[in-house]
């Protein structure tokens, strides 16, 4: 299962940590995808490492752990964020976070 804070808030110009927690007795995590709506933010692969989408490379920092640190937030960053955990065996698990960016 995926456990996450469903709603988080942060100030404009500040930063926020996007974090999902996956727990399973049988499946191991092989890859985690992070998306803003349908747009790819970053991917972590246990074997291949991190990939951060070029459009976000100046504002998205991998970590902590399998999460992301989103910096220099703007009001336009308000919205839904999705983590997708690829596991082996066991398939795909998804989590959702709503980020509200507030005026500073």
């Amino acid at each position: 299962t995926i456990d996450t804070k469903r709603n988080i808030s942060a100030e404009e110009g500040g930063s926020v940590i996007l974090q999902c927690h996956f727990s399973s007795d049988t499946a191991e995590v092989t890859q985690v995808d992070w998306k803003q709506q349908d747009q790819l933010l970053a991917i972590y692969s246990v074997d291949l490492g991190w990939h951060v989408a070029s459009v976000f490379s100046d504002r998205v920092v991998p970590g902590p752990s399998l999460g992301l640190t989103f910096q220099s937030l703007t009001m336009n960053d308000t919205g839904e964020y999705f983590c997708t955990y690829h596991t082996y065996p066991g398939g795909i698990y998804k989590g959702r976070i709503f980020l509200k960016v507030q005026e500073s």
């Epitope: 191991e28 692969s45 074997d47 291949l48 490492g49 082996y88 065996p89 398939g91």
Partner: antibody
Framework: QLQLQESGPGLVKPSETLSLTCTVS??????????WAWIRQPPGKGLEWIGS???????YYNPSLKSRVTISVDTSKNQFSLKLSSVTATDTAVYYC?????????????????WGQGTMVTVSS | EIVMTQSPATLSVSPGERATLSCRAS??????LAWYQQKPGQAPRLLIY???TRATGIPARFSGSGSGTEFTLTISSLQSEDFAVYYC?????????FGGGTKVEIK
Amino acid sequence: QLQLQESGPGLVKPSETLSLTCTVSGGSISSSRYYWAWIRQPPGKGLEWIGSIGTSGSTYYNPSLKSRVTISVDTSKNQFSLKLSSVTATDTAVYYCAIEGANFRDFGYVAFDIWGQGTMVTVSS
Amino acid sequence: EIVMTQSPATLSVSPGERATLSCRASQSVSSNLAWYQQKPGQAPRLLIYGASTRATGIPARFSGSGSGTEFTLTISSLQSEDFAVYYCQQSPPWPRTFGGGTKVEIK
């Protein structure tokens, strides 16, 4: 540019274990972040993924073959290998080794970027 | 496991014409789709990854499109060297799976 070369016996008897090796040249297998994969193709048929091993040492196998397959890496020889036990005639195929993930860091996608030329293995008594 | 279905099984096209090959996934694979070309007696060659990005050295006449469950490989003007079998493949997740292939033959 990495290159791959499969080697192993072309004929295996039913119920025995098929053993193939893929030798990597043009780079070190231990310093590369890829998946090292085996794929096969029975005569006149399509491609079937057998399994992969990652740089973390994790192995991933086709569920239909999982009970019979072992993939391992020998970094000292710059090789990775496939063992398929209890073979039958249906395991007769061209066996390819391949590298997956060369474009991951730039684009976030994985595909079988580099292939060996393949080796034909026939299972027959 | 995700099942990949290609159509048609065989496509007869005249040189210089356009060829359109389809690939359908049994569930969404986002843009995690690759296309390969295989000629008789040869290993497959990567053409397209990420559904639409051409691999190094692949001519511009090859283009890929689609996302989710429906994908297309288009060869804008078939050359003699393009007559071959084409496979689609999804990844991730595990297990990696290939479509059954489309044979593009000379009409």
